[in-house]
Interface confidence: low
Amino acid sequence: EAHKSEIAHRYNDLGEQHFKGLVLIAFSQYLQKCSYDEHAKLVQEVTDFAKTCVADESAANCDKSLHTLFGDKLCAIPNLRENYGELADCCTKQEPERNECFLQHKDDNPSLPPFERPEAEAMCTSFKENPTTFMGHYLHEVARRHPYFYAPELLYYAEQYNEILTQCCAEADKESCLTPKLDGVKEKALVSSVRQRMKCSSMQKFGERAFKAWAVARLSQTFPNADFAEITKLATDLTKVNKECCHGDLLECADDRAELAKYMCENQATISSKLQTCCDKPLLKKAHCLSEVEHDTMPADLPAIAADFVEDQEVCKNYAEAKDVFLGTFLYEYSRRHPDYSVSLLLRLAKKYEATLEKCCAEANPPACYGTVLAEFQPLVEEPKNLVKTNCDLYEKLGEYGFQNAILVRYTQKAPQVSTPTLVEAARNLGRVGTKCCTLPEDQRLPCVEDYLSAILNRVCLLHEKTPVSEHVTKCCSGSLVERRPCFSALTVDETYVPKEFKAETFTFHSDICTLPEKEKQIKKQTALAELVKHKPKATAEQLKTVMDDFAQFLDTCCKAADKDTCFSTEGPNLVTRCKDALA
């Protein structure tokens, strides 16, 4: 239904608290360098204006689109060109081009310092003093670093943050209550961020159809008792929600997500038997819970997939009559039977099936041609299964840090031209897959591993797009999203790479490393490891292990020494010499 004032409609639907939070997220994601105070002022102005429109929808400018209203606000910021350079050129455009221009200027890797968490006492003090401002800061800091973060989900994480602080700030030992809980929220939020970025990449690069296919597969796995019409309806609604969020339409996105959650809870009987617990929760928790609800029990009497999609004589007719519907039905039927497969794998199988029908339906005897299609799926299924087994075995043997190092060596060999910080970040994230997925039951490992790796590799591609340096990476990133992970896995040592010359200063360390937190120490060591591989791309695992063990021993010795500085300055050069010899 059309509303006289879009902004009044959204304000009424969402309520002031969520409205303000979402406007703050929107502004922070568009203008990532502005301070919290600058954005908070804009948010207040927009909210005050929204209230005038609620009071009188015919008031001046209340009929304007949200893009127009928000864009005008952003373009009125003083010193826009000085702070944002060519982004200011967006302001010379009319809607919808202006919003598209803002979207294109979102920076996936803004040069902002890492979001440092204050110590517990300070955090609790500022939280107690002004919880609203405290949560505003959280939304701002996360949103500007993650310009595609799923906005309604960020409100959920802010709420989690709020609840943790409420609980822990009342405890005697605030630190030990807050740290593990906030670390948990941070970890979940970072995973949520890369997953959502992958969805937006899918939408931006391949359009709504590609995203809807992803949604059909995912929803069919989760709700195997829902019929195809129900899954299609849910996938269509979910596609709309994600399109809005990826497009910066955060108020519409949050509103539609709430509507979708409401619909699902009102139609549990035709969707899934597992929704009730989620549906009993308040809005933000409900929508979050529904997004990761456990798979419903599969119907016991499902016929073999071959009946309708291989053995039926009408296959080509059905395909010709409604290609998308027929392929969608195939994806639905295959996915609901395979909660143990990754969505990426299911989409590869659907793509293979489509290619087979394209080829075979043009032949004189199509059934003879497509009759073996299910057998042709086998290598496609085996490849990720082997990947999971090999990598989980390695993780169990080496632990998370050792596993990250193994991945770092592998990926530095595949793409040595990529910057060391990017390689280290990617390897650390890829290495977390072990902790996240390898401990799960067998039937949950593959979907967990492959869909997580795909999301991390999407970030690698986004960072590489800004400064392309590796043909290997360009090749894998320019293909379809579902082929990326197999493409990266298949890469071998880049033979075109000219090794970096050995620079002693790259491997020179000082006593300040001793006081760093464990995570930062690991990053320093992993940086050195990547540089070693760039110097000797064909070094054996044994050689690299020798050097890294020597390095770890050196750090241990010097960090325990009475005179650390002297130890580092005398033993450091010896270490460098030994490294050169070991790799010679």
Epitope: K128, P131, E163, C169
Partner: nanobody, 115 residues
């Protein structure tokens, strides 16, 4: 376990008054800012008012400023909302929340303003 229990709602004529209470337990009440939020039938949640832990600072939505007064009694672990000059548009379920929470976790109390 943190618990909040609202009371004091009811049916009142336009222009009338009501005083809502919220009994809190399971946490150090005086150490936390508290808020009232409301949800009108078929609408989204709306923030109404907030108060600091000590009670010295208060905030109000424009729609209630001058008519509603938030207060607290830390010795009784109770939050209050005095509502005067009530209007039909104040009809809603009212919830108290801790620390500016974005959504309520309690049952709320229904306020109906009607002649």
């Amino acid at each position: 376990k943190v618990q909040l229990l609202e009371s004091g709602g009811g049916l009142v004529q336009p222009g009338g008054s009501l005083r809502l209470s919220c009994a809190a337990s399971g946490f150090t009440f005086s150490s936390f800012g508290m808020s009232w939020v409301r949800q009108a039938p078929g609408k989204g949640l709306e923030w109404v008012s907030s108060i600091s832990g000590s009670g010295s600072d208060t905030l109000y939505a424009d729609s209630v400023r001058g008519r509603f007064t938030i207060s607290r009694d830390n010795s009784k672990n109770t939050l209050y909302l005095q509502m005067n000059s009530l209007r039909p548009e104040d009809t809603a379920v009212y919830y108290c929340t801790i620390g500016g929470s974005l959504s309520p976790s309690s049952q709320g109390t229904l306020v109906t303003v009607s002649s």
